[in-house]
């Protein structure tokens, strides 16, 4: 890391080190030999989240309901607003600037992980012995019916999309 001319929480201006403004405040004027750095608090719906020398605060993020967004955490003078998605939707990016409908898992696939406000549904193929015959954002793969436990026999084999079909045993004498 290269050497710095100033202390932590200071910046160099006109060959002098001045204090940075604390989070939640913006720079009004640099320090001089006789005056300290002048800072002002950010206004309503504005923020700055680091020690800074910014002359303008950043606007809080707007959670646009038309994009399926809602406020998860209201912003302060030191933090941005955090958006999340309405029920049944998830963010398209880490910044959560828009939402898309949760994916459904097609027949032959089950839900491995249910979607959240920030992550999509994760599907997995139904392994041998399991099936899913619906398109769903919640349903896991179901195990095939066990005909034996019902004292029945398999009349039709199951697939990843269909359950087995059980029937009565042939009682041949």
């Amino acid at each position: 890391e290269p050497p710095t001319a100033c202390r932590e929480k200071q910046y160099l201006i006109n060959s002098q080190c001045c204090s940075l403004c604390q989070p939640g405040q913006k720079l009004v004027s640099d320090c001089t030999e006789f005056t300290e750095t002048e800072c002002l608090p950010c206004g309503e719906s504005e923020f700055l989240d680091t020690w800074n020398r910014e002359t303008h605060c950043h606007q809080h993020k707007y959670c646009d309901p038309n994009l399926g967004l809602r406020v998860q955490q209201k912003g302060t003078s030191e933090t941005d607003t955090i958006c999340t998605c309405e029920e049944g939707w998830h963010c398209t990016s880490e910044a959560c600037e828009s939402c898309v409908l949760h994916r459904s898992c097609s027949p032959g696939f089950g839900v491995k992980q249910i979607a959240t406000g920030v992550s999509d549904t994760i599907c997995e193929p139904c392994p041998v012995g399991f099936f899913s015959n619906v398109s769903s954002a919640f349903e896991k793969c179901h195990p095939w019916t066990s005909c034996e436990t019902k004292d029945l026999v398999v009349q039709q084999a199951g697939t990843n999309k269909t359950d087995v079909v059980c029937g009565p045993q042939d009682r041949l004498r």
């Epitope: 890391e1 050497p3 710095t4 001319a5 100033c6 202390r7 932590e8 200071q10 160099l12 060959s15 002098q16 080190c17 001045c18 204090s19 320090c31 001089t32 030999e33 005056t35 300290e36 750095t37």
Partner: antibody, heavy 126, light 107 residues
Framework: QVQLVQSGAEVKKPGASVKVSCKAS????????MHWVRQAPGQGLEWMGW????????NYAQKFQGRVTMTRDTSISTAYMELNRLRSDDTAVYYC???????????????????WGQGTLVTVSS | DIQMTQSPSSVSASVGDRVTITCRAS??????LAWYQQKPGKAPNLLIY???TLQSGVPSRFSGSGSGTDFTLTISSLQPEDFATYYC?????????FGGGTKVQIK
């Protein structure tokens, strides 16, 4: 009362490393930057760098960049200065020195040393 | 880096004399300057900071003045315990730099 007590004298061969310690007492260790200053025999004072014991942040003089490492252990209020790849011209008395309190300074770096360690003589000789 | 040039490099004086040491910075450093006294085998001792503020416990015969690039340390009436080496140090920006020192010796 404020005290900075340094480790004892060291004799090292060229190419070796040395680690000097500086134990602080009588004040809040994390509230003041700690600097290291050295003085070659019969010579003036040379600033090496600082460590902020609170954050662990450091700032080294260009001359020592890549060769010096300043660390601290807040649990025992001790700062360390390690100098690698020693040369004969690194023979000097090494001092730790306490700066003004954090937040004291608004303009300038205003690093003035009101308390110093007793010094550690490091001799580099083959 | 800011160069600090001290003069003279040595001065011979008697007890009771007024001694003046100057320090010049290679660029303006406002009032960010300190003066230290160092005796042989000892660590430096802070005398003055922000060019003219006397450190607690330092006798009032020591005074400092100046701003920008030119600074002065004055010992109004030299005492036996004042024979030592004096260093200026700029505290405007890092890297901190010291003057080469002024040795005050007995005439």
């Amino acid at each position: 009362q404020v005290q900075l007590v340094q480790s004892g004298a060291e004799v090292k061969k060229p190419g070796a490393s040395v680690k000097v310690s500086c134990k602080a007492s009588g004040y809040t260790f994390t509230g003041y930057y700690m600097h290291w200053v050295r003085q070659a025999p019969g010579q003036g004072l040379e600033w090496m760098g600082w460590i902020n014991p609170d954050s662990g942040g450091t700032n080294y003089a260009q001359k020592f960049q890549g060769r010096v490492t300043m660390t601290r252990d807040t649990s025992i209020s001790t700062a360390y200065m390690e100098l690698n790849r020693l040369r004969s011209d690194d023979t000097a008395v090494y001092y730790c020195a306490r700066d003004q309190p954090l937040g004291y300074c608004t303009n300038g770096v205003c690093s003035y040393f009101d308390y110093w360690g007793q010094g550690t003589l490091v001799t580099v000789s083959s | 880096d800011i160069q600090m040039t001290q003069s003279p490099s040595s001065v011979s004086a008697s007890v009771g004399d007024r001694v003046t040491i100057t320090c010049r910075a290679s660029q303006g450093i406002y009032s960010w300057l300190a003066w230290y006294q160092q005796k042989p085998g000892k660590a430096p001792n802070l005398l003055i900071y922000t060019a003219s503020t006397l450190q607690s416990g330092v006798p009032s015969r020591f005074s400092g003045s100046g701003s920008g690039t030119d600074f002065t340390l004055t010992i109004s009436s030299l005492q036996p315990e004042d024979f030592a080496t004096y260093y200026c140090q700029q505290a405007n920006i890092f890297p901190l730099t010291f003057g080469g020192g002024t040795k005050v010796q007995i005439k």
